[in-house]
Amino acid sequence: ELCDDDPPEIPHATFKAMAYKEGTMLNCECKRGFRRIKSGSLYMLCTGNSSHSSWDNQCQCTSSATRNTTKQVTPQPEEQKERKTTEMQSPMQPVDQASLPGHCREPPPWENEATERIYHFVVGQMVYYQCVQGYRALHRGPAESVCKMTHGKTRWTQPQLICTGEMETSQFPGEEKPQASPEGRPESETSCLVTTTDFQIQTEMAATMETSIFTTEYQ
C-alpha cells in the first residue's frame, strides 16, 4: 500500500528527505520538450540490503522532436551495479550509498530532468521542513513528518512548525534551525508520494546528525 496522501503542507515552508528508505521510487520525469527514452526506465528505485543501498534503473530523457533510434537497455539491478550512463555524462560515482543503513542519498540529476521530482515514499520515511527564504520558524516543535501505518492505513504525522515573515516578528531567544534526528523504524514497507518542486535538490546526507539538515543548492 502506498500513502494515500502527500506530507502535510505548511504555509511558507518546504520539505525534503535527508535520505530515502529502500523501496522509495523516484519517477523518471523529463523537462518540457523531452521524454523518457523508449524501453527506458519508468522510475528509479532505492534498493539493496542493510549494508548497501543504491538507486537502480537510470532515468534518461531524449528530445521529443527527434526520433529515438538507438536501442537503450535498462541496467540490471542484480548483476550490474555499475550504472550505464548517457554519452554526455561522466560515469556515475558511488555517491548513492547513504550513511544511514538501508537508505539511498539524493539521486544525482540526469540530463534534461524535469524541475519537479516526484517521489513515492515508504512507511518510516521522514521528511524535514524548513521555512522558505524571507520567513523564519515561530514555534520550536519537531519540524518533521513521518509516514506511518496505523490500523492498516497510512498517514503523515503533523510537523510542529509555523513560519512567519521576518518583518512580522524577531527570532525567539534560543531558536535555531531544526536538527536532523534519526529516522524511526518502519512498521511496514509501504510507499508514500512526495513532490519536490521548483528546484533541483543536491543535498548530501549529513555525515553526522549534528550539522544543519538543509544544504540545498539551487541550480
Partner: antibody, heavy 118, light 110 residues
Framework: QVQLVQSGAEVKKPGESLKISCKGS????????IGWVRQMPGKGLEWMGI????????RYSPSFQGQVTISADKSISTAYLQWSSLKASDTAMYYC???????????WGRGTMVTVSS | QSALTQPASVSASPGQSITISCTGT?????????VSWYQQLSGKPPKLILY???KRPSGISDRFSGSKSGNTASLTISGLQADDEADYYC??????????FGGGTQLTVL
C-alpha cells in the same frame, strides 16, 4: 481509499468501436503508471500496455501494438483503453492496474467485461 | 514475447506445502529481481501477494514466500488452507520495459 474504478460491461458487434475507462482515486493518480491486462474467458493474464497519466507516455506489448490504443486524461484521473474496430476475439475481461514499487501491479480494478458478438 | 512457463495445476491437502515454478529467460526473470506473484480467486481481480521475488505487501500471510534462481522463480505456500484455492500468476518486468505474465497455475486444495 485507494482504488481504481472501471467502467461497466459492454456488449458490442464486430467492427464497432469502444473505449473503456479506469478512474484512479485516493492517491496522486497522475504520478503512477496504469497498466491494462486482458483475460480471455478461461485463460490467463496478458499484459497489454501501460500509460503514465502525467504526460501520457505509453508502452505497449508487441502483441497488442496497433490493435488497441491506450490514453489518459490526467484532469479527471482516468486512463482509457480503446478499439477502433472490435473483433469477436476481443471478448475478454479487461483489468486496469496501478504500477507500484518494484515494478509490480499493486492495485487492481474490478475489471470490465467486453463481449463482442454478432 | 512468450508467456512465462508455469505448471497448469497443482494440488495438495490442507496443511501441506506446495511450490509453483515460473520459468522465463535471461531477458525477464533472469535479468531482474522484479518478479511478482498474483493470486486470483474465482470471479475476482488478481491480487498482489509477492513482489521483488520474495517481499510481501502488508496484509499478506507469511505462509507465502518466494525465491529465484537463474531464469526460474518459485512461489511456495506453506500450511495450505482451503481459501488458498485460486489461480496463481507470476509476472516479470523485462529488458524492453514491458511486462510478461505466466500462463497461470490452478491450485486445488483437496
Amino acid at each position: 481509499q485507494v482504488q481504481l474504478v472501471q467502467s461497466g460491461a459492454e456488449v458490442k458487434k464486430p467492427g464497432e468501436s469502444l473505449k473503456i475507462s479506469c478512474k484512479g482515486s485516493g492517491y496522486s493518480s497522475t504520478s503512477y503508471w496504469i497498466g491494462w491486462v486482458r483475460q480471455m474467458p478461461g485463460k490467463g493474464l496478458e499484459w497489454m500496455g501501460i500509460i503514465y497519466p502525467g504526460d501520457s507516455d505509453t508502452r505497449y506489448s508487441p502483441s497488442f501494438q496497433g490493435q488497441v490504443t491506450i490514453s489518459a486524461d490526467k484532469s479527471i484521473s482516468t486512463a482509457y483503453l480503446q478499439w477502433s474496430s472490435l473483433k469477436a476475439s476481443d471478448t475478454a475481461m479487461y483489468y486496469c492496474a496501478r504500477l507500484g514499487s518494484a515494478y509490480a501491479f499493486d492495485i487492481w480494478g474490478r475489471g470490465t467485461m467486453v463481449t463482442v458478438s454478432s | 514475447q512468450s508467456a512465462l512457463t508455469q505448471p497448469a495445476s497443482v494440488s495438495a491437502s490442507p496443511g501441506q506445502s506446495i511450490t509453483i515454478s515460473c520459468t522465463g529467460t535471461s531477458s525477464d526473470v533472469g535479468a531482474y529481481i522484479y518478479v511478482s506473484w498474483y493470486q486470483q480467486l474465482s470471479g475476482k481481480p488478481p491480487k498482489l501477494i509477492l513482489y521483488d521475488v520474495s517481499k510481501r505487501p502488508s496484509g499478506i500471510s507469511d505462509r507465502f514466500s518466494g525465491s529465484k534462481s537463474g531464469n526460474t522463480a518459485s512461489l511456495t505456500i506453506s500450511g495450505l488452507q482451503a481459501d488458498d484455492e485460486a489461480d496463481y500468476y507470476c509476472s516479470s518486468y523485462t529488458r524492453s520495459s514491458t511486462w510478461v505474465f505466466g500462463g497461470g497455475t490452478q491450485l486445488t486444495v483437496l
